[in-house]
Interface confidence: low
Amino acid sequence: LNLAYPISPWKFKLFCGPPNTTDDSFLSPAGAPNNASALKGASEAIVEAKFNSSGIYVPELSKTVFHCCFGNEQGQNCSALTDNTEGKTLASVVKASVFRQLGVNWDIECWMKGDLTLFICHMEPLPKNPFKNYDSKVHLLYDLPEVIDDSPLPPLKDSFQTVQCNCSLRGCECHVPVPRAKLNYALLMYLEITSAGVSFQSPLMSLQPMLVVKPDPPLGLHMEVTDDGNLKISWDSQTMAPFPLQYQVKYLENSTIVREAAEIVSATSLLVDSVLPGSSYEVQVRSKRLDGSGVWSDWSSPQVFTTQDVVYFPPKILTSVGSNASFHCIYKNENQIISSKQIVWWRNLAEKIPEIQYSIVSDRVSKVTFSNLKATRPRGKFTYDAVYCCNEQACHHRYAELYVIDVNINISCETDGYLTKMTCRWSPSTIQSLVGSTVQLRYHRRSLYCPDSPSIHPTSEPKNCVLQRDGFYECVFQPIFLLSGYTMWIRINHSLGSLDSPPTCVLPDSVVKPLPPSNVKAEITVNTGLLKVSWEKPVFPENNLQFQIRYGLSGKEIQWKTHEVFDAKSKSASLLVSDLCAVYVVQVRCRRLDGLGYWSNWSSPAYTLVMDVKVPMRGPEFWRKMDGDVTKKERNVTLLWKPLTKNDSLCSVRRYVVKHRTAHNGTWSEDVGNRTNLTFLWTEPAHTVTVLAVNSLGASLVNFNLTFSWPMSKVSAVESLSAYPLSSSCVILSWTLSPDDYSLLYLVIEWKILNEDDGMKWLRIPSNVKKFYIHDNFIPIEKYQFSLYPVFMEGVGKPKIINGFTKDAIDKQQNDAG
C-alpha cells in the first residue's frame, strides 16, 4: 500500500538531492505515515524538511527522475524515513555521485483560498539554489478521492490531474480548483520540477482542503472612541466564511507612553483601554479558523487613528426630543492632561453650562449631561449645538456636536371602504433639519390585535412610501389583515445612528373610512311638510354604523345644518325645515357606531324638487279699484291681489278662484286662472268677495274677505290724515280715527300720482296702527294722492283722501318720525 505523507498543517521544506546510499532501485512517490504520525497532530508546529535539489545540468541524466524526500534543516536523515512493515528505503536513489555534494532547498507553503474556490501551493527556492526559477517547469499532480474512514484509498496513477504552476523570479505558484462539494475530501498531490534538464519528484502528500483554509484579510477596519473613553477597534465580520473565525489584532500606540500588543479574539472588535489625547494608534488584524486549523490570513492593511488634544466621546450625539445625553472629555494642553475638576463646559460658545450638569468620571475625564432635551434649532448652516470642553482659561476650537430631533411623528392610517387596503400618511417636517438623513416607515404585524403598549419590534419590515405634493409620505398596505395589529414607526437613519419615532399600533378594522351611503334621496313630504332623507348603507364594513345628514338651501354658499342618526338600522330620517318650498341639497355620510374609524366622504348630493306639499296656507291679500260714478248703483269693481309667495302657496298656485256672495244671487265662484285681478259689476247693496288660491292639493282654507256695502261706504271713521315726506323714498302717514259702532278689521292705505288712473298702490295696515312709513319711489315734482280706508266686518268704509303732502307742522313731522 502506497501511503501519502500527511501535510500538517501547511508549510514544509523538501530536500531533493543525492542520497547517502548506493542502492540503484527506483521508488515511486510514497509516504511514511508511521514516522510522520507525530507530526500529524501538531496543528501549530511547522513541519520543515529540505527539498534539496541537485545542482547541474547533466545530459546523460536528463531522462532520470530524482526523487525527493522531506528533510530537516540540515538535510540529514532524509534517507532514514522507512516503512515499518517492509523496511524499504523511501529516499530516492541517484546513480551519479556528482550530485552527492550538490542540492537545492525549496520552501513550500500550501493553503485553501478564503473564498473556498482554489487550493494554492507557493514554492520559493532557498538561497544558494543553483537552478534558476524562471528556467524551471513545475507541475502539480493531484487527485480528490472521497475520504472513507479517514484513510484515502490507494491512488490510481491514471486518476491524477495535472496543473502547470506559474513561475517567476520570486518563486512558483500552483492553483488547484477544488469543487465546493469536495472541500472535505482528501487532496492527494505531488510535485514535478524540471530544471536544467533534471527532473525532481516530491513524495505523495495528502491533506483535507477544508482544514488548510487561509481566510481573506478582514475588511472594514476602523477605530472610534467609545462613550467611556476607550478605543474600539472593529472590523467587518466575514459573513461568507462557512466557519467561525478567530482574529489577531496588533496595535502600536504612540503617546506619552508606547504600547504595543497583539491580542487574539473571536469577536469582531477589541477595546483598547483608556484612549489618550494627542496619541496615534496603528492597527492591523488577521483571521484564522476558530478551531485552530488552517492558515492565518495576511494582515489587513495598517490603519492609523490619531486622537486630538481634546478628546470628546462620543464626538457627536444624535438623539430625540425629551431624552438625555452626555458627553465626556479629556483635555490635553501643552502635553499636560488637565484635571477634570478644572474643566468647564460651554454650549455654542454663548452659554456656559451650569456646573450642576457636570460630573467627574475620573481624574482626567469630565462629563456633562443634558436632560429632557429640546429640538436643536438650525443656526445658519449649523443644524446642531456645539458643545465645548474648556479649561478655566480657554476653550479648544474643537467641539462635540449635539443633534436633537423631534421624532414625534404622527402616523395616521385609513382603511378604504372596500376593506382591501390601508393607507398611512405621515409628515417628516420635524426632521428636515437633519441633513443626510433618510426616513423609512417600519412595521411589524402581529397576527391578532394590538399589544397593550406598542413597542419597537426587533423583527420589522420597511414599507415603501411615496412623497406627495403636500409634503406628506403615503404608504399603502395591500393586502391587509383586518384584525392584525400593525405596529409602525418612522426610522430616521443617519451616519450618527438611527432614531425611531414612538411606535403606534393600528388595527385596520379600527380605521375604516366607509364608502359613503348610496342611493340618497330627498323630498319634502306631502301634508306633513318634513324633509325626508333616505339612503342605503354601504356593504362594508359590517359593523353597525351611525349616519350624519347635512342639508341646506341650494345655492352658491350653502349654510349647512346637520342631523345625527345613531340608529344603525335606520335608512331614513325626517327633518323639520323652515322653507317647504325651496330646493334643499342633502348629503349623507357614515362611520362606525362605536366611534372607531373615520367618517366616510359625503354622498353625492340629492336635491329636493319643489312640489306642492300642502294646500296654500291662505288666500292672497286683495284690494279693489272702483270705476264709475259713485252716485250710481252699478259700479265696476276690479279686485287686485299680489301673487301668493311660495311659503304661503306651499308651494305653487295653479289658479285663483273668486267667491261671490250677495243676498239676491247667493254664492257663486269665478275661476280667474293665474291672473291677479278680476273685474265684476257691483249691483247689490252688499257684495262679499273671497279670493282663494288653489294648488295641486286643493284650495286655501284661510282666506281674506271683502264686503262692498253701500251703507258702509258712507261710514266715515278716519278723522284726519297727514302725509309728510321724509325723503324721496319714504313718506310718513299719520291719522286719527273716530270712535264708531262698527268693528274695524284693518285699514288700507292707497297712494298714487294725482290725476293718473294707473299706478295705484295699496297696503293693508293693522287697525291699531296710527302712523305708517310708506317706502316707495316718490318723484319730488309730482303730486301724490293718499287715501286711508277703514275696513269693517260689515264692509269698506268711507276713505279719507288728501292730495299732496301736509305743508304745515314740519316740526310735528320730525317729532313723529323720531
Epitope: L448, Y449, P451, D452, S453, S455, L483
Partner: antibody
Framework: EVQLVQSGAEVKKPGESLKISCQGS????????MNWVRQAPGKGLEWMGG????????NYAQKFQGRVTITADESTSTAYMELSSLRSEDTAVYYC??????????????????WGQGTTVTVSS | QSVLTQPASVSGSPGQSITISCTGT?????????VSWYQQHPGKAPKLMIY???KRPSGVSNRFSGSKSGSTASLTISGLQAEDEADYYC??????????FGGGTKLTVL
C-alpha cells in the same frame, strides 16, 4: 425576595374616591405589568386593569373604563389604583398582582405569579 | 356575571382525580393558549397554579395539570389531598388585550 406590599384598609363614603398603592421589591419593577384585581365579599375575582411602568400606559376592563386610573412611579417601584365615584358595590378586597412575563413579551399571557396581601375597602354611607 | 363559565362546585375523595372546566369563547379561551388557573384559600391571596394552558410554575405540585380543547380549558388535580380544598379560578387573555376570570369553583375534599 420578590414581593408586593399594599397600603392599608380603607373606609369610604359613596361618591368619594379611593387611591391604594402597591410597592414592589426584589425584581425589575419597570419591566413587569402590574395588574389590579378585586374580589367582592363571597364573590369571584374581577380584573380591573394593569400598567407597564416602563411605558406608563394602562389598559382597563370595560366595566371600569372612565372610573379607574392606574399609575406607576418607577423611582419608588410603586403602582397605584384610583377608583372614583365609589358606590356600595365597590366594597371588596383589592389585590395588586404582577404578570409573570417580562415586557416586551405579550403581557397578560403568562398569568399573575406574585400577589399583594390585599387591601380591604368598605364603601358605606 | 363572569365571562368564563366554571361549575360552582366539585368534590372528590382523597386520592381521587377531579377536573374543573372553564368555558369561554373564540375571543378568549378558544383564541389563545393563554389560560391560567389560580387557587385561593379563604382569606388568602390567589396563587398561580397553571399558566399558558398547561405550564406549571416552579413550586407547584405535578398533581396539577392543565389542558384545553376548543373553547374549554380544564384543570385536573390528581391524587386529591385535603390541602387542595379551596376556590379555583380560571382566567384568560382576550382579543381586547384584557383579562377575564371565571366565576370560580369551590373544591371540597370529602
Amino acid at each position: 425576595e420578590v414581593q408586593l406590599v399594599q397600603s392599608g384598609a380603607e373606609v369610604k363614603k359613596p361618591g368619594e374616591s379611593l387611591k391604594i398603592s402597591c410597592q414592589g421589591s426584589g425584581f425589575t419593577f419597570s419591566s413587569y405589568k402590574m395588574n389590579w384585581v378585586r374580589q367582592a365579599p363571597g364573590k369571584g375575582l374581577e380584573w380591573m386593569g394593569g400598567i407597564i411602568p416602563i411605558f406608563g400606559t394602562a389598559n382597563y376592563a370595560q366595566k371600569f373604563q372612565g372610573r379607574v386610573t392606574i399609575t406607576a412611579d418607577e423611582s419608588t417601584s410603586t403602582a397605584y389604583m384610583e377608583l372614583s365615584s365609589l358606590r356600595s358595590e365597590d366594597t371588596a378586597v383589592y389585590y395588586c398582582a404582577r404578570d409573570r412575563v417580562v415586557v416586551p413579551a405579550t403581557s397578560l399571557r403568562g398569568g399573575m405569579d406574585v400577589w399583594g396581601q390585599g387591601t380591604t375597602v368598605t364603601v358605606s354611607s | 356575571q363572569s365571562v368564563l363559565t366554571q361549575p360552582a362546585s366539585v368534590s372528590g375523595s382523597p386520592g381521587q382525580s377531579i377536573t374543573i372546566s372553564c368555558t369561554g369563547t373564540s375571543s378568549d379561551v378558544g383564541g389563545y393558549n393563554y389560560v391560567s388557573w389560580y387557587q385561593q384559600h379563604p382569606g388568602k391571596a390567589p396563587k398561580l397554579m397553571i399558566y399558558e394552558g398547561s405550564k406549571r410554575p416552579s413550586g407547584v405540585s405535578n398533581r396539577f395539570s392543565g389542558s384545553k380543547s376548543g373553547s374549554t380549558a380544564s384543570l385536573t388535580i390528581s391524587g386529591l389531598q385535603a390541602e387542595d380544598e379551596a376556590d379555583y379560578y380560571c382566567s384568560s387573555y382576550t382579543t381586547r388585550s384584557t383579562r377575564v376570570f371565571g366565576g370560580g369553583t369551590k373544591l371540597t375534599v370529602l
